[in-house]
């Protein structure tokens, strides 16, 4: 698993809707794979973390002034939808095929 | 200034091209305002940090399992270009009006 010492990468994060209080309106699934972006954005930033120019600059400044400026952060750069069955305003179970932005597709340094 | 206890916001970051070794090809300006995204992504995530659904979910999971899952991260969500004078392959000073992705326009929680 990706710890503080490992480089920025996508790791598993199973989310149970009951744990976050969303089971009141999401009927199914009970849980889903959200993924999480974990790990550091270390110099030199590799191509696979698709760094922006600003992230590259910030990484270089952090290298010179580590107490003044933070490293770039490992975050989702592309998200995917999931399908959910939920209750509408009338309480009718309805399927939303593409509930956008719920699962990490790609991680990167920003 | 935005510290660990303050909420996610854009703060000043003056970058000197000599400090990061880019003065070998960027002639001018000598420095520029890159800005930095600093501060925490605390529950509840405010609208001004434009959270994605995944960031909201991760924040809720972190609230329940703080040791297992990290908070969302405060990162640039919109970048702006700067203008730079550089030397081309023939050594001719050339102005690039829009050197993209160099300065933070907006920060958010991701």
């Amino acid at each position: 698993s990706a710890g503080a010492g490992s480089h920025c990468q996508k790791t598993s994060l199973r989310v149970n809707f009951e744990d976050i209080g969303w089971d009141s309106w999401i009927i199914a699934p009970k849980e889903y794979e959200a993924y999480e972006c974990k790990g550091g954005c270390f110099f030199p930033l590799a191509d696979d973390v698709t760094p922006t120019k600003h992230a590259i600059v910030q990484t270089l400044v952090h290298l010179k002034f580590p107490t003044k400026v933070g490293k770039a952060c490992c975050v989702p750069t592309k998200l995917s939808p999931i399908s959910v069955l939920y209750k509408d305003d009338m309480g009718v179970p309805t399927l939303k095929y593409h509930y956008e932005g719920m699962s990490v597709a790609e991680c990167g340094c920003r | 200034s935005a510290g660990a206890g303050s909420h996610c916001q854009k703060t000043s970051l003056r970058v000197n091209f000599e400090d990061i070794g880019w003065d070998s090809w960027i002639i001018a300006p000598k420095e520029y305002e890159a800005y930095e995204c600093k501060g925490g992504c605390f529950f509840p995530l405010a609208d001004d940090v434009t959270p994605t659904k995944h960031a909201i979910v991760q924040t809720l999971v972190h609230l329940k399992f703080p040791t297992k899952v990290g908070k969302a991260c405060c990162v640039p969500t919109k970048l702006s270009p700067i203008s730079v004078l550089y030397k081309d392959d023939m050594g001719v000073p050339t102005l690039k009006y829009h050197y993209e992705g160099m300065s933070v326009a907006e920060c958010g929680c991701r």
Epitope: - | A28, P29, L95
Partner: antibody, heavy 119, light 111 residues
Framework: EVQLVESGGGLVQPGGSLRLSCAAS????????MNWVRQAPGKGLEWVAH??????????HYAESVRGRFTISRDDSKNSLYLQMNSLKTEDTAVYYC??????????WGQGTLVTVSS | DIVMTQSPDSLAVSLGERATINCRAS??????????MNWFQQKPGQPPKLLIY???NQGSGVPDRFSGSGSGTDFTLTISPLQAEDVAVYFC?????????FGQGTKLEIK
């Protein structure tokens, strides 16, 4: 070695026409803005016109003193720059320099060609 | 148009001494943190040659005795120590906006 060689100068009567040419070598001609800069005898330098790149649709700009009378053009396939000068006036008498460079500076200069407008 | 005014029109300086030429723009020629100011040297019978660009950067092959400074509207070209081959006319030029304009020139001679 960068070289710009102007030709086409000479003596012409007021109201007449002349076409200057500039042959470029030693650099990728199509990558650079090209200009004409002139210098009246014993006087200072005056930018006349420039032409940008193909990616800029070969946009042109002219000094107010020549607008409507002079036309700058380029042929990237021949590494050549041109200046068509019509309705010439005595005050157009000058050495005309072909210069190449960027959107920031005149980097390369030719030796110049003398245009004399006199009756 | 941006008007460039040089001073003095001419000057005579002894070999080994410092020569200073000033250039004032009618409005600021700075933008984006960049000075759009260049200096050219023209020797008799020759085309101009780029000496200094962006106010303070030496052109290719330009000796270290040539330096430039300034920002906004006021700029200076300094030659030190002066050598015999530096006899020439010097022009400042702005490229902030079209039409790109030159100063009237400063003739440098040996005293």
């Amino acid at each position: 070695e960068v070289q710009l060689v102007e030709s086409g100068g000479g003596l012409v009567q007021p109201g007449g026409s002349l076409r200057l040419s500039c042959a470029a070598s030693g650099f990728t001609f199509s990558n650079y803005w090209m200009n004409w800069v002139r210098q009246a005898p014993g006087k200072g330098l005056e930018w006349v016109a420039h032409i940008r790149l193909k990616s800029d649709n070969y946009a042109t700009h002219y000094a107010e003193s020549v607008r409507g009378r002079f036309t700058i053009s380029r042929d990237d396939s021949k590494n050549s720059l041109y200046l068509q000068m019509n309705s010439l006036k005595t005050e157009d008498t000058a050495v005309y320099y072909c210069t190449g460079g960027s959107n920031y500076v005149f980097a390369f200069w030719g030796q110049g060609t003398l245009v004399t407008v006199s009756s | 148009d941006i008007v460039m005014t040089q001073s003095p029109d001419s000057l005579a300086v002894s070999l080994g001494e410092r020569a200073t030429i000033n250039c004032r723009a009618s409005e600021s020629v700075d933008n984006y943190g960049i000075s759009f100011m260049n200096w050219f040297q023209q020797k008799p019978g020759q085309p101009p040659k780029l000496l200094i660009y962006a106010a303070s950067n030496q052109g290719s092959g330009v000796p270290d005795r040539f330096s430039g400074s300034g920002s906004g509207t006021d700029f200076t070209l300094t030659i030190s120590p002066l050598q015999a081959e530096d006899v020439a006319v010097y022009f400042c030029q702005q490229s902030k906006e079209v039409p790109w304009t030159f100063g009237q020139g400063t003739k440098l001679e040996i005293k």
